[in-house]
């Protein structure tokens, strides 16, 4: 089969790295400077990306792969292949139309990316706040407020013994 | 214009070795890409080896692991090292860069 795609496209000859050249009769020519082809039987080369302004180099062009970039300290990457780079905020904080601000009483952000985030709601789960949230930090759970009434152990008692004929007083 | 002369061609045996020289004239070397092609009878040129814009050498499935090809900027000189040619080697040779070509040198590969 191969043999067969080859005699009818000679395109399919060109390995990554060139492109089949129809000025040249679709013989194989290596990538001009500054492009790449990154699988065989191409007809044309791929212009590097170029990694500018608050994109730098992670990986630099070849005639084989495309360059990959990331964000300059203060930004991180956002979108398939880092397309975009989005300002740091704090921690307690996220990213609006007007910059970094606080996040509100009630919600939190641990991280320098992303929104504030409501903090758990305890008793949903039938538990109590043992730790309160902060703008960094979400509340911490614990244990139910039954547990904690006085006299209340973490071991439940065995149900005392019955006689029978009595109904429980 | 760059020109391009190639010598080193010849009749060599199978499981001999010839080597490909390139000189341009030019500063041609320092920044485009170097490639070696073939042409047997009757068949399209092919690309043998290359060596890419971003300095690293390729090759052809049929060259790899018998063909070398380097570079020297110093002498405007490409080579094309060939170890254990076969039969099927036998064609003319031709040195390439950008959108200049060399005469093309013979190689023919018989016993």
């Known amino acids: 089969f191969e043999r067969t795609r080859s005699l009818q496209d000679p395109c399919s000859n060109c390995p990554a790295g060139t492109f089949c050249d129809n000025n040249r009769n679709q013989i194989c020519s290596p990538c001009p400077p500054n492009s790449f082809s990154s699988a065989g039987g191409q007809r044309t080369c791929d212009i590097c990306r170029q990694c500018k302004g608050v994109f730098r180099t992670r990986k630099e062009c070849s005639s084989t792969s495309n360059a990959e970039c990331d964000c300059t300290p203060g930004f991180h990457c956002l979108g398939a292949g880092c397309s975009m780079c989005e300002q740091d905020c704090k921690q307690g904080q996220e990213l609006t139309k007007k910059g970094c601000k606080d996040c509100c009483f009630g919600t939190f952000n641990d991280q320098k990316r992303g929104i504030c985030r409501p903090w758990t709601n305890c008793s949903l789960d039938g538990k109590s706040v043992l730790v309160n949230g902060t703008k960094e930090r979400d509340v911490v759970c614990g244990p139910s407020p039954a547990d904690l009434s006085p006299g209340a152990s973490s071991v439940t008692p065995p149900a005392p013994a019955r006689e029978p004929g009595h109904s429980p007083q | 214009a760059v020109q391009l002369v190639e010598s080193g061609g010849g009749l060599v045996q199978p499981g001999g070795s010839l080597r490909l020289s390139c000189a341009a004239s030019g500063n041609i070397f320092s920044i485009r890409v170097s490639a070696w092609y073939r042409q047997a009878p009757g068949k399209q040129r092919e690309l043998v080896a290359w060596i890419a814009w971003d300095n690293i050498a390729h090759y052809a499935d049929s060259a790899k692991g018998r063909f070398t090809i380097s570079r020297d900027n110093t002498k405007k000189t490409a080579y094309l090292q060939m170890n254990s040619l076969k039969l099927e080697d036998t064609a003319v040779y031709y040195c390439?860069?950008?959108?200049?070509w060399g005469q093309g040198t013979q190689v023919t590969v018989s016993s």
């Open positions: 390439n860069s950008g959108d200049s």
